[in-house]
Amino acid sequence: GPVWRKHYITYRINNYTPDMNREDVDYAIRKAFQVWSNVTPLKFSKINTGMADILVVFARGAHGDFHAFDGKGGILAHAFGPGSGIGGDAHFDEDEFWTTHSGGTNLFLTAVHEIGHSLGLGHSSDPKAVMFPTYKYVDINTFRLSADDIRGIQSLYGDPKENQRLPNPDNSEPALCDPNLSFDAVTTVGNKIFFFKDRFFWLKVSERPKTSVNLISSLWPTLPSGIEAAYEIEARNQVFLFKDDKYWLISNLRPEPNYPKSIHSFGFPNFVKKIDAAVFNPRFYRTYFFVDNQYWRYDERRQMMDPGYPKLITKNFQGIGPKIDAVFYSKNKYYYFFQGSNQFEYDFLLQRITKTLKSNSWFGC
C-alpha cells in the first residue's frame, strides 16, 4: 500500500474537542506521533496554518468523507492512508468522550492507532498490537508498541538510526523530490535561493545542481520555524522574514537586534494578521506583499505603502492566485510564484505566465 515518500511530515489539529483542554489534546497528539518517530526515521512537526500532510479533525456524523461516524461507541475514529488531499488525515468521532485517562476513550491510545493508519499500516491480528482493530485501554505511562507494530512500521520506513543522517542533504532527496512538495517562503539571498519549509530551509546556489537542507535554527537560532514570507533587498544586504504578525531583519546573514517587530509598522491595516508571500523588485524599488487574495505595494525608498492598495492578485497578475504560498524575483524580469506543488514563471514586463513548473523543479527532480 501507499507510504509517505519523505521522512519529514507535518500535522495540523484542525479543531479541538470540548471534552479536553487544548493543551492536553496537543500533548496527546504530539506523544502519539512520538511513539512512531521513536522507532522510525520519521520526524513530525505541528503546524498551525496551511496545508499539513496529516490533518487531525474532531467531527460527528457525516463530516465530508464517505465514512460518517455512528454516534457514541462503535467506530471511534478513522484515518486515511498516505497521500495528498484527504490522504493521511485522522478523524475522531466527537460523539465519544475523549480523555487523558482510562475513563471515556483515551485520545492518546486512539491517536497512536490512527496515526499508524496515516503512515500506511493496516490492522494487526495480534491482540497485543496497537494496530489490533478493537480499542482496549492500557496504562499510558507504560505503553509500548508491540513487536508486530514495530515490524510493520519498520517494513515501511526502516529503523530510527536513519535519523542520524538527517539533515544530511543526500537523505533529504525523498522529501525534496516529492511531487506534492510545497514551500512556505522562498527568497534569493545574493546568488543563492532559500526555500523555507516548516523548520527547514533548502539552499540552492544558482546554476549548481547541489542543494543542501538545513534547520533554520542552525543558521539563525533566534528565529522561529514556519517562516511564512521572505524577501531580499540585495543592494542593502537585507533579508526580511515574516511569521504571523511579526518580521525579522537579517543583515549580511546576521539577525539584527531589536527584532521581531510588528508587520503593522509597514502600514498594514489591523485585520492583516500574517503575510503569505513577499517579493522586492529592484527595478521599481517596491516590495509586493501578498495577503490572502490581495496584495499591497510598499515603497522601500519612502518607507510607506503606495496609495490605491490592496488590489486583487488575480486582477493584476494574469493567471496567478487567488492566493499564493511564496514568490521570489530572478533574472531581472521574472517573478516565480508558488501555489502548492505548482510554480509559475511570470514575466512582469509582459505581465503573463511564461512557464509552469513543479515547485521543486529547482532541484533537478
Epitope: 500500500g1 501507499p2 496545508m51 490533518l55 465530508g64 486515511f80 484527504i86
Partner: antibody
Amino acid sequence: EVQLLESGGGLVQPGGSLRLSCAASGFTFSWYWMHWVRQAPGKGLEWVSGISPSGGPTMYADSVKGRFTISRDNSKNTLYLQMNSLRAEDTAVYYCAKDIRGPYSSGLFDYWGRGTLVTVSS
Amino acid sequence: DIQMTQSPSSLSASVGDRVTITCRANQSIYTYLNWYQQKPGKAPELLIYAASSLQSGVPSRFSGSGSGTDFTLTISSLQPEDFATYYCQQAGIFGQGTKLEIK
C-alpha cells in the same frame, strides 16, 4: 497507463436484471477502492456504489440500496455491479471510477471509464 | 446529511474571460472538495482535488479555493476547449453541475 473498461450495458425491461463489469489495468487493482457513478440522459452525475480494496466494506446510495450489489474479483482485476429490480429511473450511462487510495475511500475519483449505457424500458 | 449547492447552473462566456463557479456545502467539509470537467459524450475528468490542488496535467489557468462550506473554481482566461460542464463533488455527493457555454 490506467485503463477502465465497462461492459454489460443494454436494454432491459422494468423489474429485470443486468450485470455490469469493469476491467481494470495499469495499476495495482487490489490496493484501491472502486466505485460506480451514473449519469441519466441530460442530467448530472450520481454516485451509486463503492467497494473497499478487499471487497469487505461496501457502500450504496439510498436510491439503489437493496437492489444493486457491488463486488470485485481482485485476481481478475474486475469490478462488478449486479442490478436487480431495475426501474425506468435507473436508465443512465454507468461509469466505473478508481478511488485515489485505500484503506478508507477518499471519495476522490482520479480515473474513470468511458461508461456503458443501461436503458430500462418496456 | 451533507448537501452541495453549485451555482450558477449555466453560464455564457467568451474566450479570454475569467470565470468563477461556486459550490456551497450545508456544513463544514474542511477542504474535502473536488472539481471535475465533463465534455459531451465523454467521462468526467478530475481537475482540482482537496479544494485547491491542481491534478497533474491540468492547465494552470484552472484554480480552486475555499474551505469549510464555500468553494470556488476559477478559470483565469477561458480557452475554446474549456467549454464543458463542471461538477463539484464531496464523497458521494455531486453538485448539480454548471454548463459553461460560448457567448
